[in-house]
Amino acid sequence: SAPGEDEECGRVRDFVAKLANNTHQHVFDDLRGSVSLSWVGDSTGVILVLTTFHVPLVIMTFGQSKLYRSEDYGKNFKDITDLINNTFIRTEFGMAIGPENSGKVVLTAEVSGGSRGGRIFRSSDFAKNFVQTDLPFHPLTQMMYSPQNSDYLLALSTENGLWVSKNFGGKWEEIHKAVCLAKWGSDNTIFFTTYANGSCKADLGALELWRTSDLGKSFKTIGVKIYSFGLGGRFLFASVMADKDTTRRIHVSTDQGDTWSMAQLPSVGQEQFYSILAANDDMVFMHVDEPGDTGFGTIFTSDDRGIVYSKSLDRHLYTTTGGETDFTNVTSLRGVYITSVLSEDNSIQTMITFDQGGRWTHLRKPENSECDATAKNKNECSLHIHASYSISQKLNVPMAPLSEPNAVGIVIAHGSVGDAISVMVPDVYISDDGGYSWTKMLEGPHYYTILDSGGIIVAIEHSSRPINVIKFSTDEGQCWQTYTFTRDPIYFTGLASEPGARSMNISIWGFTESFLTSQWVSYTIDFKDILERNCEEKDYTIWLAHSTDPEDYEDGCILGYKEQFLRLRKSSVCQNGRDYVVTKQPSICLCSLEDFLCDFGYYRPENDSKCVEQPELKGHDLEFCLYGREEHLTTNGYRKIPGDKCQGGVNPVREVKDLKKKCTSNFLSPEKQNSKSN
């Protein structure tokens, strides 16, 4: 029988009345245009909604916008457009919400053609009040907050100036001209690239990378011949043009650009690209595009310095620069990532890793599913997940995979069961163990969200027709109840719940199908009365993550340690609550070869845990470039996986000797760098 229709599915008692009492409709006095929604702060209940409406006139488009504010998680909204003097707000800049709980908001206004500069509206009290500020420049990008100090803002102007404010946008100073890209680093540092000759495009590959640690009083050039740069975790990456040809290489710094090392990654040509797929303080996943217009490349995983890389996954699907990749960090379980590969026959298959890229495998076929037409063998096939690429290809996939750090083990995604991703209408699948096993959760495409740290899952069917029904589950997607939240169906445009999945409120957004005027409408449903009581100790059960063989003493060991979690029993209908903290008990494991990556010059043959020398390097001294010096590596082929905490057990030898020789391949050594003060 279909999910949710089993006899053992216990119904939540009297849920219709409970939800009806907690369903709040708000019709916006607005013609349908576009709507954007932002949460201001964490657990504040404050939501800002900006509606914009463009009326096509004969020679131009007339725009108007309205700003609404809720302070009760979307149950009620107040029109606060007058606080911004009824000004038209530019949606392409969005609402710039300050970090953490700063309560800061910046809105960028549309100004008339001949004006000297742009205009912003600033709030530092969770949008209760706004101050209008006229800018001495026209912004090209949204205001960017320093992660460390929300009073510090930076923006690029349409004339490529880098502007900084130290008092939350009250006063602005142009600290540099001819800037292409600027990013905040740690400790209020700003990194930016500059061009010398014509423009950012013309100088691509000849840009300079600069740093200021004092908001523009002084500068240091930390890189030349730069193509682009990026920040990930504690790593600063720059792709740098080679001296002799048009190829580029990645260089890495872990000290804000003072010293650089060349990453042991393949160089790329003009039509290729590098992409940081994921990064944390331990390591980085780097995609290196294949030559030619193949649509795939190779994933490499780094060591703890971001320098030595191991090949992690071949034929990784990534269409073009800034294109689509399905690479997804499963945030509900440590070490788990999902992505797609392009097979030799051009079909797309999903792969999963449970050990941070150490090894990849297909997703296990859900027990309650049949193999589809793509499967050669009807008894052997895998689950394939639809993500960004499928969405970009306009397949019937309304949402990317979903996981939340505080909903341990839960992953929800659209997928198909076969030998490859299917273009047929997908179903929704759920894993409750971080991707090891899967179950079909809902028939057909749906929007979905996680509430109360996994205590409730909410879904809405994806349909081109107006809808008025929401589905919810209190047992991690096994059984579903349906609730008709409005008599008059609406064209559904999105589900909104507070980021972090701790809330019990869900807002359903859409617009009315009307004989008069179509209007924006939101229905906010509070599930607090469905989960009547707070969860107690008896509602939780112990769960060992990454468990595949309970008989094995090392069962659950991933990256050198295992973790036991307290997880809500599926049968318990209770509130985890806003203050819920994931309870986990880690224990260190003995080291095995699985805790080591293959070192520079070594690789792991398929289905083998041993690292063997790359044939082309056999018998050669292993030398590589580090901090501008040449190093000699003595290794038996292994290095510990970044973040791996294992102790004892297997302990391969690894030693690095400084050869005291300069690297000719390195693009910058410390003495070449120059500083400059304003």
């Epitope: 349908r32 009307s514 004989f515 008069l516 005027t517 179509s518």
Partner: antibody, heavy 117, light 112 residues
């Protein structure tokens, strides 16, 4: 500026069929409900058909139900009225109208339909 | 069907003088959503009808404020404080609360 231009009116025999069109411009067509209203030769106004913003819902008075069909193509910004089984009492000028917070906010200039043997 | 009865059928006025037209419905026009869907339209000679007032008393954009609409339930009135030449034509009331939507027979405003 809201602009509604009707076309397709003609002289037709009783029992015959006709399709009227209304091309809309100067506003976002897909947001608004639309109606056809006819004015009879004795200058009385009669509402004939109505369609919701997305084209999901339609309404008709009993006098035309089953004979007239209102439709819209939001991609083409066009409203239609398919008329069949026409009777002499269907004679009149057919106006396309746009709604807003209430009915019949804007009117087209009309197209003349004459049902006569 | 809701019958809309307009009086008078013809109103002869002098430019600069006030004018008043009444419209009565056979049922209350108060909708369940709290709104009353009563419109007033003007059709000038040789032109299409044009809406002047909606929801009993709201003036459409560009309509001079010498026009006012009032009433509730089943009784509604359109007033012109000082008639001008451009106000001449046929005035229709119409209701949109109940299907089918219905119109009054019209009141012709003409010069004395």
């Amino acid at each position: 500026e809201v602009h509604l231009v009707e076309s397709g009116g003609d002289l037709v025999n009783p029992g015959g069929s006709l399709k009227l069109s209304c091309e809309a411009s100067g506003f976002i067509f897909s947001i608004y409900g639309m109606s056809w209203v006819r004015q009879t030769p004795d200058k009385r106004l009669e509402w004939v058909a109505m369609i919701s913003s997305g084209g999901i819902y339609t309404q008709y008075p009993d006098s035309v139900k089953g004979r007239f069909t209102i439709s819209r193509d939001n991609a083409k910004n066009t409203l239609y009225l398919q008329m069949s089984g026409l009777k002499s009492e269907d004679t009149g000028t057919y106006h396309c109208t746009r709604h807003d917070d209430s009915w019949f906010a804007y009117w087209g200039q009309g197209t003349l339909v004459t049902v006569s043997a | 069907d809701v019958v809309m009865t307009q009086t008078p059928l013809t109103l002869s006025v002098t430019i600069g003088q006030p004018a008043s037209i009444s419209c009565k419905s056979s049922q209350s026009l108060l909708d369940s959503n709290g709104k009353t869907y009563l419109n007033w339209l003007l059709q000038r000679p040789g032109q299409s009808p044009k809406r002047l007032i909606y929801l009993v008393s709201k003036l459409d954009s560009g309509v001079p404020d010498r026009f006012t609409g009032s009433g509730s339930g089943t009784d509604f009135t359109l007033r012109i404080s000082r008639v001008e030449a451009e106000d001449l034509g046929v005035y229709y009331c119409c209701q949109g609360t109940h299907f089918p939507l219905t119109f009054g027979a019209g009141t012709k405003l003409e010069l004395k």
